[in-house]
């Protein structure tokens, strides 16, 4: 099956920027999200630091650290009130994201 | 909203022990790892060091043995110095160190001076 | 011992116009990608533009573009304005456990003509 342009695999994920108009200065400010075509029982999430399109239940159930969000050999912790989680790199550094 | 503020700094003499504290409120410590950077004046910026919750701090090599970093509440983070000298004359900046550091506080001058 | 090379260390831009900031790493970042660039005015705290090397930090213009992995990254400002006049930072993440968990270049400054 041949993909038409802008139209992504399935199960295939990409980051887009978004342009939108204006903060205080009158200048354009943007936002990047990612843009998946998610397979049926799928949704975007998170796998190895990159987007992804993981388990719907992960998500509904808010096990994040399912998804394998973080990099290979960094531990995964679920934050208070599953709100998202946070990755321990080898040498103590934490990262956090934090799920709206 | 998450915020960030230095406080402590101020003219001291060389050979001084001074700590500063890093306020932080709208995120909380036990989540997030805070960094310190300075900046001597028309200088560039100079990363001291870094703590995350329930490690131990980690340290510029030229930064270890007389700076010290420690969370001292459940929203405060200190750096002591030792030993100052005027080379030490600089902004001292928190920032919470994430995806990057952001956001970060105003900065506290400490002018070393005899 | 750990190091960020930027350069060049001062630019000038025409408004409108397109100005390229490199930043060298001694060894690579963590993940290849944990590099982040910064912008700092006088008188204020470095503002956060860009992570991970190409991310965009939030409400940050899309006139602001990073590249790169490993070891050499790039920042392109396009379309020029007077008020990107500042000094512009990159700032590398290594791994804790086997070196200085952080580093900064030493800066570049941008002029606009």
């Known amino acids: 099956q041949f993909l038409k342009e802008g139209q992504l695999a399935a199960g295939t994920c990409e980051i887009v920027t978004l342009d939108r108009c204006c903060n205080k200065n009158r200048r354009t400010i943007a936002r990047q999200t990612a843009r998946c075509a998610c397979r049926k029982g799928q949704i975007a999430g998170t796998t190895r630091a990159r987007p992804a399109c993981v388990d719907a239940r992960i998500i509904k159930t808010k096990q994040w650290c399912d998804m394998l969000p973080c990099l290979e050999g960094e531990g995964c912790d679920l934050l208070i009130n599953r709100s998202g989680w946070t990755c321990t790199q080898p040498g103590g550094r934490i990262k956090t994201t934090t799920v709206s | 909203q998450e915020q960030l503020v230095e406080s402590g700094g101020r003219l001291v003499t060389p050979g001084t022990t001074l700590t500063l504290t890093c306020t932080v409120s709208?995120?909380?410590?036990?989540?997030?790892?805070v960094s310190w950077v300075r900046q001597a004046p028309g200088k560039g910026l100079e990363w001291i060091g870094y703590i995350a919750n329930n490690y131990n701090p980690h340290y510029a090599s030229w930064a270890k043995g007389r700076f010290t970093i420690s969370k001292t509440s459940s929203t405060t983070v200190d750096l002591k110095m030792t030993s100052l000298t005027t080379e030490d004359t600089a902004t001292y900046f928190c920032?919470?160190?994430?995806?990057?550091?952001?956001?970060w506080g105003p900065g506290t001058l400490v002018t070393v001076s005899s | 011992e750990l190091d960020l090379t930027q350069t060049p260390s001062s630019v000038s831009a025409a408004v409108g116009g397109t100005v390229t900031i490199n930043c060298q790493a001694s060894q690579s970042v963590y993940n290849n990608k944990n590099l982040a660039w910064y912008q700092q005015k006088p008188g204020q705290p470095p503002k956060l533009l860009i992570y991970?090397?190409?991310t965009l930090a939030s409400g940050v213009s899309s006139r602001f573009k990073g590249s790169g992995s490993g070891t050499q990254f790039t920042l392109t400002i396009s379309d020029v304005q007077c008020d990107d006049a500042a000094t512009y930072y990159c700032q590398g993440e290594f791994s804790c456990s086997s070196a200085d968990c952080n580093a900064f270049g030493g800066g570049t400054e941008l002029e606009i003509l």
């Open positions: 991970a090397a190409s």
């Open positions: 920032a919470r160190d994430n995806y990057g550091m952001d956001p």
């Open positions: 709208g995120f909380s410590l036990s989540s997030y790892g």
